[in-house]
């Protein structure tokens, strides 16, 4: 015997109390793909989430976070703090750098500055709490007298620190 | 159904006090950190304050410490705010929302809120 809930589209379930046949998802409900048994319930976004895409008899609802929150998770699971630059999100809420890291961003942890002098740089640009240092020539470029022909410096092994 | 219903809002004079109310439904209240947020009319989302799943912690947004306590009580599954000395910024739209699986470990990001309750402070 032919099974005829695999006829029924998208949007549609097979209504097993209705001789199998294709009936339209409830209200709030939907169905992705054919030959569905049931309909799904639509994704509500209430409270910190909001509505990014209104469910249809063929999709749920997508959800995006309200203003001050970014979506984290698949599908936008949760919703999480923004801090401002310079600040990390800590559970006693947004914390500024402490001193020799930044961040530069909304979201993240706190990185540490770039060590110039293990690359054999010097620091062009001081960091801060929200930007990087800037590293620039190594310290014997700058020195007066020093010759333009310098070698750089040997190339370090990945994964290798400076003895 | 997990569902979070916050009640206790209201019209209130700046330097009074209200206890906003979220009763939790479909999960295990004492599983999870809980948290106030708010909104502001035309701003963003603010975190307010969390407490842990025992109540031994308890975190607030620097505008509110003094002034506002987080509390649950887990046999009744509910999550309360008593907010005192209130002001006319802390007139806002208050949510309670869940923090997800991991919450403090990995992420802070918060998986379930209710609708709100409307808290105005004006004389």
């Known amino acids: 015997l032919q099974d005829l809930c695999s006829n029924c589209p998208a949007g549609t379930f097979c209504d097993n109390n209705r001789s199998q046949i294709c009936s339209p998802c409830p209200p709030n409900s939907f169905s992705s793909a054919g030959g569905q048994r049931t309909c799904d319930i639509c994704r509500q976004c209430k409270g910190v989430f909001k509505t990014r895409k209104e469910c249809s008899s063929t999709s749920n609802a997508e959800c995006d976070c309200i203003s001050g929150y970014h979506c984290l998770g698949a599908e936008c699971s949760m919703c999480e703090q923004d801090c401002k630059q310079g600040q990390e999100l800590t559970k006693k809420g947004c914390k500024d750098c402490c001193f020799g890291t930044f961040n530069d961003q909304k979201r993240g942890i706190c990185r540490p500055w770039t060590n110039c002098s293990l690359d054999g740089k010097s620091v062009l640009v001081n960091g801060t709490k929200e930007r990087d240092v800037v590293c620039g020539p190594s310290p014997a470029d700058l020195s007066p007298g020093a010759s333009s022909a310098t070698p750089p410096a040997p190339a370090r092994e990945p994964g290798h620190s400076p003895q | 159904e997990v569902q979070l219903v916050e009640s206790g809002g209201g019209l209130v004079q700046p330097g009074g006090s209200l206890r906003l109310s979220c009763a939790a439904s479909?999960?295990?209240?004492?599983n999870y950190w809980m948290n106030w947020v708010r909104q502001a009319p035309g701003k963003g989302l603010e975190w307010?304050?969390?407490?842990?799943?025992?109540?031994?912690?308890?975190y607030y947004v620097d505008s509110v410490k003094g002034r506002f306590t987080i509390s649950r009580d887990n046999a009744k599954n509910s999550l309360y705010l008593q907010m005192n000395s209130l002001r006319a910024e802390d007139t806002a739209v208050y949510y309670c929302?869940?923090?997800?699986?991991?919450?403090?470990?990995?992420?802070?990001?918060?998986?379930?809120s209710g609708q709100g309750t409307t808290v105005t402070v004006s004389s």
């Open positions: 929302a869940r923090g997800g699986e991991g919450y403090g470990v990995d992420h802070y990001g918060l998986d379930v």
């Open positions: 479909g999960f295990t209240l004492s």
């Open positions: 307010v304050a969390n407490i842990n799943q025992d109540g031994s912690e308890r």
